[in-house]
């Protein structure tokens, strides 16, 4: 593991990353749950959507989210004009025309209705911390991840590589 400076190093170029092409390389419909198997659910309340983290009853159907995967070129650290590698960015849409957005000022995760092209706040860098878990890092705020706080989704700052594996930023994707 590479310590705090390493986290800053691998996130600093996110601002400069460019999404290659406007269409996703693939799309994947999945239910989203926390590391502790609580479900992420979406409810329409007063013409806006609320996001909840909750235990579902035994036969209760899980909400699905459409994950759209985009390739993003990552500039080379050395020269600035080369490409060091590729990242996967995702957008998450639980219902037509609504996407998860990072509200960095409020440290919150919100559902916004918007048209394409989507704003940068709707894009999240996809991380695998474990073989069966993913994390979502804000494109607009490197080092900040979607996480669980008080039974809601929130934005959580991760300031060291040890904290990258903290359970509250780990999520499971399931087709069932």
């Amino acid at each position: 593991a590479f310590g705090i400076s390493g986290v800053q190093k691998y996130t600093r170029a996110l601002h400069d990353s460019s999404i290659t092409g406007i269409s996703p390389i693939t799309e994947y419909l999945a239910s989203l749950s926390t590391y502790n198997d609580q479900s992420i659910t979406f409810a329409l309340e007063d013409e806006s959507y609320e996001i909840y983290v909750e235990d579902l009853k035994k036969d209760e159907k899980k909400d699905k989210v459409l994950l759209s995967y985009y390739e993003s070129q990552h500039p080379s650290n050395e020269s600035g004009d080369g490409v060091d590698g590729k990242m996967l960015m995702v957008t998450l849409s639980p219902t037509k025309d609504f996407w998860l957005h990072a509200n960095n000022k409020e440290h919150s995760v919100e559902l916004h209705k918007c048209e394409k092209p989507l704003p940068d706040q709707a894009f999240f860098v996809l991380h695998n911390m474990h073989s069966n878990c993913v994390s979502f890092e804000c494109k607009t705020d490197p080092g900040v991840f979607i996480g669980v706080k008080d039974n809601h989704l929130a934005l959580i700052k991760v300031d060291s590589s040890e904290n990258l594996c903290t359970e509250n930023i780990l999520f499971k994707l399931s087709e069932t």
């Epitope: 593991a1 650290n77 996967l88 911390m129 594996c165």
Partner: antibody
Amino acid sequence: EVQLVESGGGLVQPGGSLRLSCAASGFTFNNYWMTWVRQAPGKGLEWVASITYTGGGTYYPDSVKGRFTISRDDAKSSLYLQMNSLRAEDTAVYYCTRANYYYNTYGGFPYWGQGTLVTVSS
Amino acid sequence: DIQMTQSPSSLSASVGDRVTITCLASEGFSNDLAWYQQKPGKSPKLLIYAASRLQDGVPSRFSGSGSGTDFTLTISSLQPEDFATYFCQQGSKYPLTFGGGTKVEIK
């Protein structure tokens, strides 16, 4: 240019140990999951071990679990495979591979080393 | 574990032929499927990832398709340098698994 260079292969007796190394260059090593894949003579490809980009997680198939250990040294941009209690069926060319994307396992293995041959025989 | 069954295990074809290789998974998964080409004494080379994405530098005569449990690699017009062994690989669930390979030989 991305380069992966394996070393450490050779002839070893059953029950013996061997440590393979993979020297990586041409990319930001600590941003990638790394994986060992092997190929027995005249056979197909078999996944051997994977390690997360942080080094915090390691994964193995049942065939090597408890005998093989994958590790990484980001300061040296190096990947390792410690192989203990070797068996005749571990005889294979061992390849070091790199994931396609930063931080992620998705998208196959675009970069492979030249491979190093491990022969387990008495 | 997800078993990947490739067919045929070998085939003979001529330059210019259209060649199709299939990979059948024992259970459905997201489209994290890759295809590799390997020539004798060489390391495998990634051709296709995400079931249908062409890896940089790979000729456009190679294409991939499929989802769920059925995946296909197609070579639209076989070239002399395409005679090799081809492997599929799923990356969706651990343990990662490869197909048994398809050897494409000259007729």
